[in-house]
């Protein structure tokens, strides 16, 4: 590497890279400055003068250290669905993700740009697996024994209450009723909730999301209103 | 949502090789600086490669240059680190990271990897 | 190569205490230096950049300052959380290098 008395631009010696915060310059052959986030380079540098910088204009920015000519723009303004979990700054893109009870269908690398509703469960039907950021919620019809009477994104399949006399026995969409005796064992009587997904602010706090069981094919999937899957509503 | 995961590393015999890699998701793998840095057992970090967000720039410290090499496939979103001749004092926890801004500040750091000495 | 030497090594201190520990390079680095977090087990992670930038999510009890050859980190209200490493590092120039380490515990 070049003694640290060198000032930019300078010529690297042979088999050396230029020093952080630096890049070389095909056309000069010379280590030249970079720009910092938030500027970009207004004039390339010659072998007598080093970059100059320039800040990036509104609604666009620059995330790194870099040479670029101009500051990239910010992505378009969050829809109807989404939060804006991330502002657009010199120094950074918009970030949108999605809404509590929706989830992203399609991801990019940063954010999300398709958000979908979470599936919910209709009667008879409870939550196997709660939705994530990431992936929709999957139902199940209730087990003997079990029953849900509600359409729900957090509900799950709860336990019949057990009477000593039964008036009307239970369903997987309706609880045991009882005759006026007491019953010997009764669940609670609010419905078991599973959490819904958060959406965070940082990137670096995020609980990892359980990876979808269904194939990433978002993609290719019509943009309008699909049919409900089995227990769901579209609700 | 940004995760990096480093492969397994494990034992080598002293003069041995092995390659390790890093899968990247949640962020633009491609315009990342990247870096690989160690930590022997119960001893602190040490610094040990970087590559530029295009593969072109790649740096050593001296411990391990002429040894180890590190690279990128930015088509399959990951990291490598070649390391021949490997020698007892290269026994260490080995970490993946991403640098926020192309200016060796580590802001994302893959779970580790031991690679270990089986002599 | 630029040595980095953090002081002290280890420390103990109350939950509620203020916390410094110090971090001295052999030349001058700007502003060029960041401090970082570990946990037993655990990878390291980034709290302050560039000397005094709080990194996103992380708490504000966190702080750093100084620049040139020396930098303070500090925590305002130690919590039972913060029992972990910190390290400090130095991006001014190449080889990247961190200081030794500071351990703190609580009392």
């Known amino acids: 590497l070049p003694a640290q008395v060198a000032f930019t631009p300078y010529a690297p010696e042979p088999g050396s890279t230029c020093r952080l915060r630096e890049y070389y310059d095909q056309t000069a052959q010379m280590c030249c400055s970079k720009c910092s986030p938030g500027q970009h380079a207004k004039v390339f540098c010659t072998k007598t003068s080093d970059t100059v910088c320039d800040s990036c204009e509104d609604s666009t920015y620059t995330q790194l250290w870099n040479w670029v000519p101009e500051c990239l723009s910010c992505g378009s303004r969050c829809s109807s669905d989404q939060v804006e979990t991330q502002a657009c700054t010199r120094e950074q893109n918009r970030i949108c993700t999605c809404r509590p009870g929706w989830y992203c269908a399609l991801s990019k690398q940063e954010g999300c740009r398709l958000c979908a509703p979470l599936r919910k469960c209709r009667p008879g039907f409870g939550v196997a697996r709660p939705g994530t950021e990431t992936s929709d919620v999957v139902c199940k019809p209730c087990a003997p024994g079990t029953f849900s009477n509600t359409t729900s994104s957090t509900d799950i399949c709860r336990p019949h209450q057990i009477c000593n006399v039964v008036a009307i026995p239970g369903n997987a969409s309706m609880d045991a009723v009882c005759t006026s005796t007491s019953p010997t064992r009764s669940m609670a009587p609010g419905a078991v909730h599973l959490p819904q997904p958060v959406s965070t602010r940082s990137q670096h706090t995020q609980p990892t999301p359980e990876p979808s069981t269904a194939p990433s094919t978002s993609f290719l999937l019509p943009m309008g209103p699909s049919p409900p899957a089995e227990g769901s509503t579209g609700d | 949502q940004v995760q990096l995961l480093e492969s397994v590393g494990g034992l080598v015999q002293p003069g041995g090789s092995l390659r390790l890699s890093c899968a990247v998701s949640g962020f633009t793998f491609s315009t990342y600086a990247m870096s690989w840095i160690r930590q022997a057992p119960g001893k602190g970090l040490e610094w040990v490669s970087i590559i530029s967000d295009g593969g072109d720039v790649t740096v050593y410290a001296d411990s391990v240059k002429g040894r180890f090499t590190i690279s990128r496939d930015n088509s399959k979103n990951t990291l490598y680190l070649q390391m021949n001749s490997l020698r007892a004092e290269d026994t260490a926890v080995y970490y993946c990271a991403r640098d926020r801004t192309s200016a060796a500040a580590f802001d994302s750091w893959g779970q580790g990897t031991l690679v270990s000495d089986s002599s | 190569d630029i040595q980095m030497t953090q002081s002290p090594s280890s420390l103990s201190a109350s939950v509620g205490d203020r916390v410094t520990i110090t971090c001295q390079a052999s030349?001058?680095?700007?502003?060029?230096l960041n401090w970082y977090q570990q946990k037993p087990g655990k990878a390291p992670k980034l709290l302050i950049y560039?000397?005094?930038t709080l990194q996103t999510g992380v708490p504000s009890r966190f702080s750093g300052s100084g620049s040139g050859t020396d930098f303070n980190f500090t925590i305002s209200s130690l919590q039972p959380e913060d029992i972990a490493t910190y390290y400090c590092?130095?991006?001014?120039?190449?080889?990247?290098?961190f200081g030794q380490g500071t351990k703190v515990e609580i009392k």
């Open positions: 030349q001058d680095i700007t502003n060029f």
């Open positions: 560039d000397a005094s």
């Open positions: 590092q130095q991006s001014d120039s190449y080889p990247i290098t």
